[in-house]
């Protein structure tokens, strides 16, 4: 806490600028008028002004918005939102994108601190969900931002902000989140032509179920081994040789090189060595000719 | 007086382009969006485009406006509006509008300027 | 981009009486709806902010209301003065809000 003074003779700041530098912390306590701040909080990031003369302005602002801070004054926060506590950042109201962009801006080339994880969580509150404009702004910031939500943040993604999303912000994203992803991620393509709709959709196939791989194997869009490697195996087991074939198209060779990591190899255990023979690519591991398939899963589920 | 007056409308020919003007009078326009606005005879409001003065300058479109029409800032009291390739679709008239340093809440609009296209 | 529908469109109500018009956003805005009310060969005028805010000079017979996706506007005690059209408008910044119009809900006061 600062210890309350008069203010000195003549001392008393008529507006915020440079001449304050020279003021110790206890003067500016004194001197600086906490609503005069308030509206000329955009000058405070150009005067180079200590830390501690930073704690004292932001303790102004504290006493005059002790509900928290009204978003005209935080838009213009700049280096003094590093000086705020995410339970500081709790009382805010954050609405406009130019605010958000803003904070960003300040603790930019820094990993995601608490503060802005905090500012992030109020500002999708205020404006009622993560739209595209605000996804937009995120992944330029923290291309990781998507993948750093749980499956229970994402549900609450609108499917027209999917369009904001590119390849490089699922790269961290693990299955249970694509599983969320890729039916906003369909809902948001479903318009587009074929080849069109298979770019567009490529990055979130790591949760498309079989039958949605099955219906890509008709439409030649020739999978490279990068995004095969990446579905979901349980997605993956039920499809045939042949559909393996139409997936990949010319990238089925890649298969040898994948004979030993899922989901390739799991597929395999579950292919006759002949129609794995057919492939021509010396695949091993198939079921041997002449014995016989038993679907367990299917015969519990009927007993 | 805070004041928003549009200039620049008036008949012009189908493929042409245009370029429309808001000027500001008794405005202090460091923190705003400005934003145009139009609307063609007897139908609905449609909002073109908005850009942020002071800060980050950022401008913002309608989809259907990209490419087309753009937006700037010309002086510290005008914005224009360039537009391309016009067609008797965009007869309308042309508002300005400004909206607040956060947001699009339109409290001060122009009177609007008359862009006819037609051969 | 956020869609808003209005309805109904036209609405016809007697002088004195109540009319309400609502607005509907295609996806959640919490309160970022404005209200504004337009007369022929005339800009827009701006009524209602934030979903219930009442703009500085305006009526308090004009009252708006709502959240999320659903918003409503209520004319009471209607004066002949208060023919005309309305339109919604989701106040948020950014490229998905630069065209978040309602197509406008005409009021005619009989």
């Known amino acids: 806490e600062v210890e309350k003074t008069a203010c000195p003779s003549g001392k008393k700041a008529p507006e915020i600028d440079e001449s304050l530098i020279f003021y110790k912390k206890w003067e500016l306590e004194a001197c600086v008028d906490a609503a005069l701040l308030a509206t000329q909080m955009d000058r405070v990031n150009a005067i180079p002004f200590t830390y501690e003369q930073l704690d004292v302005l932001k303790h102004k602002l504290d006493e005059l918005y002790p509900q928290g801070y009204p978003e005209s004054v935080i838009q213009h926060l700049g280096y003094l939102f590093l000086k705020m506590s995410p339970e500081d950042i709790r009382k805010w109201n954050v609405t406009s994108l130019e605010t958000l962009k803003a904070l960003l801006e300040v603790n930019k080339g820094h990993e995601m601190s608490p503060q802005v994880a905090t500012l992030i969580d109020r500002f999708v509150k205020g404006r009622g969900q993560l739209d595209k404009d605000t996804l937009d702004t995120l992944t330029a910031f923290y291309p990781g931002y998507l993948c750093s939500l749980s499956p229970e943040e994402l549900s609450s993604v609108p499917p027209s902000s999917i369009w904001a999303v590119r390849p490089q912000d699922l790269d961290t994203c693990d299955p249970r989140q694509l599983d969320v992803l890729y039916p906003k991620a369909r809902l948001a393509f479903q318009n587009m032509n074929g080849s069109e709709y298979f770019v567009k959709i490529q990055s979130f196939l790591g949760g498309a179920p079989t039958e949605d791989l099955k219906a890509l194997s008709q439409q030649n869009v020739s999978m490279d081994l990068a995004t095969f490697m990446k579905l979901r195996t349980d997605a993956v087991l039920p499809l045939t040789v042949a559909e393996v074939q139409k997936l990949l198209g010319p990238h089925v060779e890649g298969l040898k090189a994948e004979e030993r990591h899922r989901p390739v190899r799991d597929w395999i255990l579950r292919q006759r060595q002949d129609d794995l023979d057919t492939l021509g690519l010396g695949l091993q591991g198939g079921i041997p000719n002449g014995y016989l398939v038993l679907d367990l899963s299917m015969q519990e589920a009927l007993s | 007086q805070e004041q928003l007056v549009e200039s620049g409308g008036g008949l012009v020919q189908p493929g042409a382009s245009l370029t429309l003007t808001c000027t500001a009078s008794?405005?202090?326009?460091?923190?705003?969006?400005m934003c145009w606005v139009r609307q063609a005879p007897g139908k609905g409001l449609e909002g073109i485009a908005c850009?942020?003065?002071?800060?980050?300058?950022?401008t913002y479109y309608a989809s259907w406006a990209k490419g087309r029409f753009t937006i700037s800032k010309a002086s510290s009291t005008t914005v224009t509006l360039q537009m391309t390739s016009l067609t008797a679709a965009d007869t309308a008239t042309y508002f300005c509008?400004?909206?607040?340093?956060?947001?699009?809440?339109?409290?001060?609009w122009g009177p609007g300027t008359l862009v006819t296209v037609s051969s | 981009d956020v869609v808003m529908t209005q309805t109904p469109s036209p609405v016809s109500a007697a002088v004195g009486g109540t009319v309400t018009i609502k607005c509907q956003a295609s996806?959640?805005?919490?309160?970022?709806l404005a209200w504004y009310q337009q007369k022929p060969g005339q800009p827009p005028r701006l009524l209602i902010y934030?979903?219930?805010n009442l703009e500085s000079g305006v009526p308090s017979r004009f009252k708006g209301s709502g959240s999320g996706t659903e918003f409503t506007l209520t004319i009471s005690d209607l004066e002949c003065d208060d023919a005309a059209t309305y339109y919604c408008?989701?106040?948020?910044?950014?490229?998905?809000?630069?065209?978040?119009f309602g197509g406008g809900t005409e009021v005619v006061v009989r």
């Open positions: 509008a400004r909206g607040t340093n956060l947001n699009y809440i339109f409290r001060l």
């Open positions: 008794g405005i202090d326009f460091s923190r705003y969006y």
């Open positions: 850009i942020y003065i002071g800060g980050s300058g950022s």
């Open positions: 996806q959640s805005i919490n309160n970022g």
């Open positions: 934030s979903a219930s």
């Open positions: 408008q989701c106040i948020w910044d950014g490229n998905s809000y630069v065209n978040a």
